[in-house]
């Protein structure tokens, strides 16, 4: 009868999350009698696994009939493998005694645990930026083992480069996060536009996981402020109108000012969406000049998103001549811009109408 | 520590039947077999038969086939051994016994069971 | 089936001296590399005690006085110095097949 020997003869063993482990252990000899136990980890602080002789270890099954004559197998099955089962596993062989005494341990088979990375989530910044400005966005990925991956970002389906990547811990771990950032420069065009961000695993069969984020959550388009005036009608009214052009979002304010004061305030709402994302929206407001012995001076004063107001004036002349000779009376706009601390730039060209 | 502890003595008529129970502690019940044996005053041992509680597979002495019946309550760790249509010499102490090493021996042992027949 | 058949029936032997008893089964109980051989002690009033499994290997706690050995059909338990509380009636079991028990051996001191 040969000296016992405990047999495990697979060093390592990789499994996926929520399968079933087979960790196999075999003894050459009957002699001595005792239980096998299965520990995970070495040392005091082992833990224990499986006791064939007592405790109720629900997740682990023995392969053979512990009660099977002649058995020297002594192979586990845990079900349901989680990241956390990720470890170095011992069969070990006690000679029964009072208590049963350690007699030979196994060499030891590693378990890992192929995990799945989670759905990576991409958040955006806190608050809206500008075109021209640079945005950073992050994504999250967490609960994946082994430990290599790979994350790449997009934008609009063309891969960006300037983003950077941690996978943590850097240490050995039971299972991994990743975290990218990546900084995008937005344009005036990417309300339309989306951030993709793609991560690559072993355990997803070369079908990546994506995450999105939309730019439209991320930017905001401000307005260009156009004035046009109709010629006057016969009742000696002049419509103007304030043409906003080009936003976005669409929490937009309108006031108009006569000289000053508040004439009419409007929130903007279900506006047709241009095709780039963006809105247009016209106000109006008609003008009684007979009403007035000077000039009118108009103001279109624009709320956009939360940010300072931007005005754009307009002065409608109104004729020194009184009406019934048949005097002319002109409207002008004199195309100024007050900006307050915005940077919107004025495209606008002055207008000068002349209306008889 | 293993422990096997039997039911009280039982005194019978011949004809009757008696159940013995065995309740096991100290280790997982369904990992060992139980063998019963008994032994008649001054006499040697007798094997019975033994059962797995895991599965109630069992094996009797072809002397004691007919008569006995061993079950087990794994819900308490039970086991039992029925012996029917008794008679004068099945006056014994009866042993239950926990095979440890499956090798179809007797490791630990209850204190012991006595049965009497008598009319 | 396999009959075991031990021998003497009864030993008287003086303290400190060598006590031998011998088991011959009708048949080979070697299987599996193995002798399914095993041998109990029973003190008076009290239960059997595993001594020896599988013809040589001791169990946990037996004193090394007490020894097996054989193979195939004949076997033997040796206590290689007598002491007081050894006085028993040894029994030998086979389990090649279903278990059965030699019908035992009466030690006392002479």
């Known amino acids: 009868e040969e000296e016992l020997q405990v047999i495990q003869p697979e060093k390592s063993v990789s499994v996926a999350a929520g399968e079933s482990a087979t960790l196999n252990c075999t003894a050459t000899s009957l002699i001595p009698v005792g239980p096998i136990q299965w520990f995970r980890g070495v040392g005091p602080g082992r833990e224990l696994i499986y006791h064939q002789k007592e405790g109720h270890f629900p997740r682990v099954t023995p392969v053979s009939d512990p009660t099977k004559r002649n058995n020297m197998d002594f192979s586990i099955r845990i079900s349901n493998i989680t990241p956390a089962d990720a470890g170095t596993y011992y069969c070990v062989k006690f000679r029964k005694g009072s208590p049963d005494v350690e007699l030979k341990s196994g060499a030891g088979t590693e378990l890992s645990v192929r995990a799945k990375p989670s759905a990576p989530v991409v958040s955006g910044p806190a608050v809206r930026a500008t075109a021209e400005h640079t945005v950073s966005f992050t994504c999250e990925s967490h609960g994946f083992s082994p430990r290599d991956i790979t994350l790449k970002w997009f934008k609009n389906g063309n891969e960006l480069s300037d983003f950077q990547t941690n996978v943590d811990p850097a240490g050995k771990s039971v299972s991994y996060s990743i975290r990218s950032t990546a900084r995008v420069v937005l344009t005036r065009r990417d309300v339309h536009s989306q951030v993709i961000c793609e991560v690559a695993h072993v355990t997803l069969q070369g079908d990546p996981l994506r995450g999105t984020a939309n730019l439209s959550e991320a930017i905001r388009v401000p307005p260009f402020l156009e004035f046009t005036q109709q010629s006057m009608r016969a009742d000696n009214q002049v419509n103007v109108t304030c043409q906003v052009m080009k936003f976005y979002p669409q929490r937009l304010q309108l006031t108009w000012l006569e000289n000053g004061n508040v004439s009419r305030t409007e929130m903007a709402s279900a506006l047709p969406e241009n095709k780039d994302g963006t809105y247009n929206w016209t106000s109006w407001l008609l003008v009684n000049v007979s009403a007035h012995r000077d000039d009118v001076k108009l103001t279109c004063q624009v709320e956009h998103d939360g940010q300072p107001a931007v005005n754009k004036s307009f002065s409608v002349k109104v004729s020194a001549h009184p009406k019934e000779q048949g005097s002319n009376t002109a409207a002008e706009n004199t195309g100024t811009n007050e900006r307050g601390s915005s940077d919107y730039k004025d495209d606008d060209d002055k207008h000068h109408h002349h209306h008889h | 520590q293993v422990q096997l502890v039997q039911s009280g003595a039982e005194v019978k008529k011949p004809g009757a039947s008696v159940k013995v129970s065995c309740k096991a502690s100290?280790?997982?019940?369904?990992?060992?077999?139980i063998n019963w044996v008994r032994q008649a005053p001054g006499q040697g041992l007798e094997w019975i038969a033994m059962?797995?509680?895991?599965?109630?597979?069992?094996h009797y002495n072809q002397i004691f086939k007919d008569r006995a019946t061993l079950t087990t309550d794994t819900s308490t760790s039970t086991a039992y051994m029925e012996l029917r249509s008794l008679r004068s010499d099945d006056t014994a102490v009866y042993y239950c016994?926990?095979?440890?090493?499956?090798?179809?021996?007797?490791?630990?042992w209850g204190r012991g069971t006595l049965v009497t027949v008598s009319s | 089936d396999i009959v075991l058949t031990q021998s003497p029936d009864s030993l008287a032997v003086s303290l400190g001296e060598r006590a031998t008893i011998n088991c011959r089964a009708s048949?080979?109980?070697?299987?599996?590399?193995?002798?399914?051989i095993f041998w109990y002690q029973q003190k008076p009033g009290q239960p059997p005690k595993l001594l020896i499994y599988?013809?040589?290997n001791r169990d946990s706690g037996v004193p090394d006085r007490f020894s097996g050995s054989g193979s195939g059909t004949d076997f033997t338990l040796t206590i290689s110095s007598l002491q007081a509380e050894d006085v028993a009636v040894y029994y030998c079991?086979?389990?090649?097949?279903?278990?059965?028990f030699g019908q035992g051996t009466k030690l006392e001191i002479k």
């Open positions: 048949q080979s109980v070697r299987s599996s590399g193995y002798n399914w």
């Open positions: 079991q086979e389990s090649r097949e279903l278990p059965t």
């Open positions: 059962i797995d509680p895991s599965d109630s597979e069992t």
């Open positions: 016994a926990m095979d440890y090493g499956s090798l179809y021996a007797m490791d630990y």
């Open positions: 100290g280790y997982t019940f369904t990992n060992y077999w």
């Open positions: 599988l013809a040589s």
